[in-house]
């Protein structure tokens, strides 16, 4: 991974594009920390394992988070 101690945040660019929850392998929410003072959301896609940085402020991404958490709560007993 192209990472050095000087890199503070993971996302170089962020995307507003809606993501189909069915095409998601994984959704990571990285809270703000001493290294990166903002929340970062990284989607791993099933296709080719592409990772995409998402805009936490985007309406489409907020809807995605809601959909994913709803799906998770359905699955958990």
């Amino acid at each position: 991974v192209p990472l050095s101690r000087t890199v503070r945040c993971t996302c170089i660019s962020i995307s507003n594009q809606p993501v189909n929850p069915r095409s998601l392998e994984k959704l990571e929410i990285i809270p703000a920390s001493q290294f990166c003072p903002r929340v970062e959301i990284i989607a791993t896609m099933k296709k080719k394992g592409e990772k995409r940085c998402l805009n936490p402020e985007s309406k489409a991404i907020k809807n995605l988070l809601k959909a994913v958490s709803k799906e998770r709560s359905k699955r958990s007993p």
């Epitope: 192209p2 170089i12 660019s13 962020i14 594009q17 995409r52 940085c53």
Partner: antibody, heavy 124, light 109 residues
Framework: QMQLVESGGGVVQPGRSLRLSCTAS????????MHWVRQAPGKGLEWVAV????????FYVDSVKGRFTISRDNSKNTLYLEMNSLRAEDTAIYYC?????????????????WGQGTTVTVSS | EIVLTQSPGTLSLSPGERATLSCRAS???????LAWYQQKPGQAPRLLIY???SRATGIPDRFSGSGSGTDFTLTISRLEPEDFAVYYC??????????FGPGTKVDIL
């Protein structure tokens, strides 16, 4: 459509300074990392500098470290390159380029929008 | 620092022929970090391929990328007159820095 327009190039003497600008339109500038890439006459492409979408990180090629500074003003949709202590070997066309949507340190989507370039000539 | 080498330096072909361009890295590169660009005289570069094999938006399917580790390939299945240009591979490496190869010129025979 998505567009980048560079300005600020010109002829300058060695040791002097110049500031390049790149104005973006047609996309949400504040969402994308941005690069400067240069091309010396008759030569290949050389990456110069990158800035994260929010300015949180900036990186440079070794040959310009300490002399060039990349910055951005998201409220003006503008990217800058401040060039100090210019040398003859900095003579080139300077392009600004947009980092693809969603790029991060784990996956790289390439430089997907480029300006037409501005020419910098360093000569006495 | 990873160095990219492209071969051949110049490739002379006729329209309709297949072009195979090579990009070799001095150390292993993750395919997630390998891109290809096309540049025509007097124009800015254009992104063709990212992630070693994914076509950028609007790129015709005659362009394809493949490879892993240290060896990557850009293939143009049938050269069109507008494909004669210089092609650069590029990698995103640690520090982070973004290194270009020296380019391959595809010439009309």
């Amino acid at each position: 459509q998505m567009q980048l327009v560079e300005s600020g190039g010109g002829v300058v003497q060695p040791g002097r300074s110049l500031r390049l600008s790149c104005t973006a339109s047609g996309f949400t500038f504040s969402n994308n990392g941005m690069h400067w890439v240069r091309q010396a006459p008759g030569k290949g492409l050389e990456w110069v500098a990158v800035i994260w979408f929010d300015g949180m990180n900036k990186f440079y090629v070794d040959s310009v470290k300490g002399r060039f500074t990349i910055s951005r003003d998201n409220s003006k949709n503008t990217l800058y390159l401040e060039m100090n202590s210019l040398r003859a070997e900095d003579t080139a066309i300077y392009y600004c380029a947009r980092e693809g949507d969603g790029s991060g340190i784990y996956y790289y989507y390439g430089m997907d929008v480029w300006g037409q370039g501005t020419t910098v000539t360093v000569s006495s | 620092e990873i160095v990219l080498t492209q071969s051949p330096g110049t490739l002379s072909l006729s329209p309709g022929e297949r072009a195979t361009l090579s990009c070799r890295a001095s150390q292993s590169v993750s395919s997630s970090y390998l891109a290809w660009y096309q540049q025509k005289p007097g124009q800015a570069p254009r992104l063709l391929i990212y992630g070693a094999s994914s076509r950028a938006t609007g790129i015709p399917d005659r362009f394809s990328g493949s490879g892993s580790g240290t060896d990557f390939t850009l293939t143009i299945s049938r050269l069109e007159p507008e494909d004669f240009a210089v092609y650069y591979c590029q990698q995103y490496g640690s520090s982070p820095i973004f290194t270009f190869g020296p380019g391959t010129k595809v010439d009309i025979l």
